[in-house]
Amino acid sequence: EQVKHSETYCMFQDKKYRVGERWHPYLEPYGLVYCVNCICSENGNVLCSRVRCPNVHCLSPVHIPHLCCPRCPDSLPPVNNKVTSKSCEYNGTTYQHGELFVAEGLFQNRQPNQCTQCSCSEGNVYCGLKTCPKLTCAFPVSVPDSCCRVCRGDGELSWEHSDGDIFRQPANREARHSYHRSHYDPPPSRQAGGLSRFPGARSHRGALMDSQQASGTIVQIVINNKHKHGQVCVSNGKTYSHGESWHPNLRAFGIVECVLCTCNVTKQECKKIHCPNRYPCKYPQKIDGKCCKVCPGKKAKELPGQSFDNKGYFCGEETMPVYESVFMEDGETTRKIALETERPPQVEVHVWTIRKGILQHFHIEKISKRMFEELPHFKLVTRTTLSQWKIFTEGEAQISQMCSSRVCRTELEDLVKVLYLERSEKGHC
């Protein structure tokens, strides 16, 4: 039955809710979160709030999976027949309801100290970026309930307590088939201090916000009385309103002036600035702080397609942009890592095809900058130096041999970390 335009309803995670209707949301990577109640308000906005649990007056309160708050044993509801929860199929492997597992290549903007934690909940796979604690030992160990490695004897960090996590659902969003990823998503900002332990409060790109980008419904999350509205974009900790433009801030290199981002409702769309092929003067000059060359003596006007440049130097060495693209389908992952160089003017693309952890194929392509600019599925991940790229390619040669005969889960992801130039290293050239 079609809903008449005059009727008010709420859209939330592709479902329609009537005014006054209440529900528990699906939040990645938890599944159904019983400790959050959502309600469809009269103006069509979704209002979600954390359930406040009353104090229980008994010695051993009992936790029931589908109820948020612990209860005293005498006030428990009657036990129904056991409900069998649906398992999940992901990348050729079956996972049981509640099972945690690690996925590769899902997040384009994964930082070196993050890993991808997934869980199976009621037949749906939920994945999130988990920010791992700094390791203080030489030989960290893997633990069953976390994708982060920990030092032996450390108290294991639970999923809920990890700061700054971003969540994405691979089953229905860009991680699976990222055909039109033309925008550049800056790496997540590391926020110190906590609003709340509930990850939805962390970021506009948290589970609630993410699912609302297409429908236009404003999702208001109320946790600890902190309000967040969805009709803005957040980049690097800064909030931009619809129509506003900015240059993204990329880790250690500050502002990337040759990329221009615009806020479109809640989605940031970033485009590379194209400089003109021909100039009105014979010898246009490269000026620090400008993206495009300018004719001497002429005031460089801020034209569309012309802006400032921040090539970024690291320890006196010029840096170059590194892009990445990951496709996963039918148990096969195609990962492409690309380096854009000025001399020669080209993009070197390293293509990895991995099936069930075994490297099927590796090759290098060199394509023109102009052609590369038209490829929508690459995302700018960092800038690196030629010396770091050399280390990367040497390591790549080793693991391309090693991983063609044995299962490699994280070797390539770990190797990519070499390309990131940490701010902390700046004093140690």
Epitope: T334, Q360, H361, E365
Partner: antibody, heavy 119, light 107 residues
């Protein structure tokens, strides 16, 4: 060794559609772009477009945007081109070719499929 | 679109002769240029890529040169099996564009 085996010759009526195939073997199909090129009798080569089998992303020459549709089936390592609303101008040999700039722009070519449009 | 102007459109040459075919792009193509050879009833075969790099298995009598907008293919000493049509291709920008071809025949 690398081989691109194209389907047999097609005879079609104006207004009809044809689907040509290009089966790849001897290399990692999903790792390389697959291009399609048209060559009319006694004429030069015209680039139609390419498909990246890993992402199924396609790029077309605007002259063929409404004429050709490129698809790829990774399970059978086969690329396809669907030509619709055929006219006499579409009579040509259609080639598929793999693409890797490191080794060469178009390294391996299929043997070509001849399409004849005739009433 | 980038226009590739190839010349000559046809030429006659003798065995052992040095042959040069040129291709001019309508704009700088940053050496993203390939040369192909095609024989009657056959599919094209790649000879040169990135303007001057010889494809494995291609005889060393073939060489490519040029930069910016102007490129050339040279056969240092023509042999009988070199007869055919030669095409240049730019792959600096979409759509990829070919030259109209140079038909090389025996004098």
């Amino acid at each position: 060794q690398v081989q691109l085996q194209q389907s047999g010759a097609e005879l079609a009526k104006p207004g009809a559609s044809v689907r040509l195939s290009c089966k790849a073997s001897g290399y990692s199909f999903s790792s390389y772009w697959m291009h399609w090129i048209k060559q009319r009798p006694g004429r030069g080569l015209e680039w139609i477009g390419y498909i990246d089998p890993s992402s199924r992303y396609t790029k077309y020459n605007l002259n063929f945007k409404d004429k050709a549709t490129l698809t790829a089936d990774k399970s059978s390592s086969t690329a396809y081109i669907l030509l619709t609303s055929l006219t006499y101008e579409d009579s040509a040999v259609y080639y598929c070719a793999t693409y890797s700039n490191y080794v060469g722009a178009m390294d391996y070519w299929g043997q070509g499929t001849s399409v004849t449009v005739s009433s | 679109d980038i226009k590739m102007t190839q010349s000559p459109s046809s030429m006659y040459a003798s065995l052992g002769e040095r042959v040069t075919i040129t291709c001019k792009a309508s704009q700088d193509i940053n050496s993203f240029l390939s040369w192909f050879q095609q024989k009657p009833g056959k599919s094209p075969k790649t000879l040169i890529y990135r303007a001057n790099r010889l494809v494995d298995g291609v005889p060393s009598r073939f060489s490519g040169s040029g930069s910016g907008q102007d490129y050339s293919l040279t056969i240092s000493s023509l042999e009988y099996e070199d007869m055919g049509i030669y095409y240049c291709l730019q792959y600096d920008e979409f759509p990829l564009t070919f030259g109209a071809g140079t038909k090389l025949e025996l004098k």
